[in-house]
Amino acid sequence: GITIPRNPGCPNSEDKNFPRTVMVNLNIHNRNTNTNPKRSSDYYNRSTSPWNLHRNEDPERYPSVIWEAKCRHLGCINADGNVDYHMNSVPIQQEILVLRREPPHCPNSFRLEKILVSVGCTCVTPIVHHVA
Amino acid sequence: GITIPRNPGCPNSEDKNFPRTVMVNLNIHNRNTNTNPKRSSDYYNRSTSPWNLHRNEDPERYPSVIWEAKCRHLGCINADGNVDYHMNSVPIQQEILVLRREPPHCPNSFRLEKILVSVGCTCVTPIVHHVA
């Protein structure tokens, strides 16, 4: 990996043992200034592998609300607007980091957690041919 | 929102002002035990809107490596294996949280940051008709 020279103005950290506890400023900086995430908000409906978005809420997690995609069909929508079962709608998944309150119900103490979320769906050629 | 009763065993936090600084344990807990993320690892190739994955590395960020999807084609792959420009390959984007070292180069001090990443691609019916 890349070795970064330590900034002498860093906050002091006495405990060098793992599990490593760090200070995190929750005042979020948004780097998405030149891209509009809402631009893709209608893809769930216009896709040949459309999906619905389900709200997953957990007050012990930060962010507390995550939207999960569920593909609407097993197959994909063809040019006639019908479901073609010779193709498969599948979820595109991504591992994301969230903060889990630890100990539970603590406002200022968290643990990093990795969760797998479905972001949307794509249409793929099947590897198992259920439809002759 | 939901009010959570405070756990009396929480670490003490004197500073109640925003920007809020919290303690985060970086020993990641992985909740994806019953899901195999590699299951979807070939979708990028089998999709009708295939994509390539580009490595984005930043040592000042945690995680330092993020994979970005770039759609391979403007159109989508049809049943004959050709690119059909009457349909559009588009990126499915998601806002994710990462930790940015702040001040820079500090190993134990971070700020939450929201970034937009392309996770994969999907095939959509066009709204802008470039192809007659």
Epitope: N34, T35, N36, R39, S40 | W51, N52, H54, K70, C71, R72, H73, L74, G75, V83, Y85, N88, S89, V90, P91, V124, P126, I127, V128, H130, V131
Partner: nanobody, 123 residues
Framework: QVQLVESGGGLVQAGGSLNLSCVIS????????MGWFRQASGKEREFVAA????????VYADSVKGRFTMSRDNAKNTVYLQMNSLKPEDTAVYYC????????????????WGQGTQVTVSS
Amino acid sequence: QVQLVESGGGLVQAGGSLNLSCVISRRTPSGYAMGWFRQASGKEREFVAAISWIGGGAVYADSVKGRFTMSRDNAKNTVYLQMNSLKPEDTAVYYCNDMPYGLDTTMDDYDYWGQGTQVTVSS
């Protein structure tokens, strides 16, 4: 911020040719496609052509199909527009830009343009 530098424009007679180039000064463009657009005096900016960085397939507006060819050089982060059989109605300022949503990109998705390069076709 991505920087776009277009060049290669000029004054040419009808039936002549020009080759425009556009250099993107960022390690990797944010999108997966690049486009050429043009804006004639007093008219709205319009799509001319687009190309995929990876696949290399290009798409053209009906008005330029068969006359213009778009290509790209990934190593140089540069795209080109070879314009043949030019017509007076091709007179415009030509711009290139990243297409973050490929063919789904609309003019509303842009908040930044380069300075463009003027193409003038005389009859």
